[in-house]
Amino acid sequence: AATSRPERVWPDGVIPFVIGGNFTGSQRAVFRQAMRHWEKHTCVTFLERTDEDSYIVFTYRPCGCCSYVGRRGGGPQAISIGKNCDKFGIVVHELGHVVGFWHEHTRPDRDRHVSIVRENIQPGQEYNFLKMEPQEVESLGETYDFDSIMHYARNTFSRGIFLDTIVPKYEVNGVKPPIGQRTRLSKGDIAQARKLYKCPACGETLQDSTGNFSSPEYPNGYSAHMHCVWRISVTPGEKIILNFTSLDLYRSRLCWYDYVEVRDGFWRKAPLRGRFCGSKLPEPIVSTDSRLWVEFRSSSNWVGKGFFAVYEAI
C-alpha cells in the first residue's frame, strides 16, 4: 500500500541514515542486512548520512517498533527498533514504512480480499485495522498482496493466539493464503517499490564479491531507447575493480547517443569515472569505496554487440 504523496518519496531513491542509540554490533549488522535487502531488489539506496538535511535515524522510542511513512522532510526522522523487533524481517518491514509503504491490510480495497474479525481484536487496538483514506494510498496497479512483508499476520493484535483478526476471503492456488510473513520482500513489494521509485526496467544490484553483467541481448545487439542501471555493492571496506571485456556501442562525439557510464558511488550524482562508447576498451576502473554505479543508455537503432563487464571485490 504505497503512499500517494510525492513529497513522501525520497528524491532519487536515496535515503541517508544514521544508526544512533545503544545498538549492539549484531543489531547494527541486522540493520545493514535489511537495508542491503531493499537495495538488492529495488533502486532505493541507503547512504550513511554526511550533511543531508533529511535522514533516518535508527533509534529506540516509546512506540517500540515504528516509523514515519516515507520522507518527512525538514530534519531527521526516527525509525524505532525496540526490544524484540531487531530481527531481519521486522527491520525490512519497518524500512518498508520508511520507503513509503503503509500496511497492506489498510488498503482502501482490502474488504474485497480480507475480513476483519473485530470481536477478536484486543480492546483499544481497533485503530490498527482502519482502512487508509483512498487519497492517501496509490497501489500503482499492483493487486492486493497477501504475501507482502507489510501485511499483518492472521492473529496480529488478537485477544488470543488462536483467534484470527484477519482472514483472507478466498483461496489462492487451492489454499487460503498465508499472511504476515517477515522473511523477505515479496514479488509484489518489489514490483510496487520499483514503480514508486521509477526504477529502470533493466539492470540490477550486484552484491556478490565477484560477478558480471552485460547490456541486454549481448552479444546479439541492443535495441533503441534502452535504459539500464547496475549498482555494484560489496562489503564496506573493500573496493571494486571493474573490467570491460567487450565493448561495441555506437560511437559518437562525447558518447552523446549510446553509452555506458561508470560513477564512483551508488547513485546518479556520484563522481563520473568515465563515459564509454565505440569499441575501445577502457582501462580497468577501481572504485574509491565499496560501491559503483553503471548506467547504459541507447538512443540509436545501430546494432552493435553491446558490452560485457566483470567485477571483483579487492
Partner: antibody, heavy 122, light 107 residues
Amino acid sequence: QVQLVQSGAEVKKPGSSVKVSCKASGGTFSEWAISWVRQAPGQGLEWMGAIIPKFGTAEYAQKFQGRVTITADESTSTAYMELSSLRSEDTAVYYCARGAKYYYAEDYMDVWGKGTTVTVSS
Amino acid sequence: DIQMTQSPSSVSASVGDRVTITCRASQGISSWLAWYQQKPGKAPKLLIYAASSLQSGVPSRFSGSGSGTDFTLTISSLQPEDFATYYCQQALSLPYTFGGGTKVEIK
C-alpha cells in the same frame, strides 16, 4: 490546553508498592507518549519509562525493569506508574510528562504534572 | 546508555549578564536535545527542543545551539526570574537521559 493532574503524596513502608496516577485533561491522550521521571531530594532528573496509551505497551529504563509497571486507561485518560519493592532510595518526587505523538520524530516533554511526593520510611 | 555531561554545575551571575551552559553527549545525538528549566518545588519546564527551537511562550533571550555531541544553552540577558536549575536531555534513544543540572545563582 493540556494539563496533567497527578495523585496526592504517599508515605510507604520499605518492601511495599506505590501506584501514582496521572490524569490528562483538555486534549487528546491516547496517541501521546507519557513518560515518568523521578527526582530524589536534591538530585537530578531520572527517566523511568514511558507508555503510548494507544499502543498499550510500555518501555522501561533497565534500572527499573521488573520493579516498575506503567499502564494507561484510555477511557479515563489516565496513566499509572506502580513501583514495587520500595526502598528508602525511592523517596522522590515522581512526575508524569507528555512526550511525542507516536509517529513523529521529536520526543520532548512539553507538558508536566506537578509531581507526586513518595516517601519511603519504616 | 547515552551519558549527558553538563557544565558548569553551578554559576553565579548578575541580572543582565550573559550566561552560557554546555552539555556534552557521550555519542552523537544529531539535534535531538532538549533544555529544561526547573525552579525549587516546581516541575521542569521545556525551554528548547530539537537543540535550537524555542518552545512556545519562552522568552527570546533563551537560545540553544549545537549538533552531534556538543550543545549550548545561552541566556543573553539574565532576568530575576531566570535564577533556577537547567537540565539538558537527550531525546534520541531510550532510556532518555538528563544532564546533572546547572544551578544559576544570584551573585
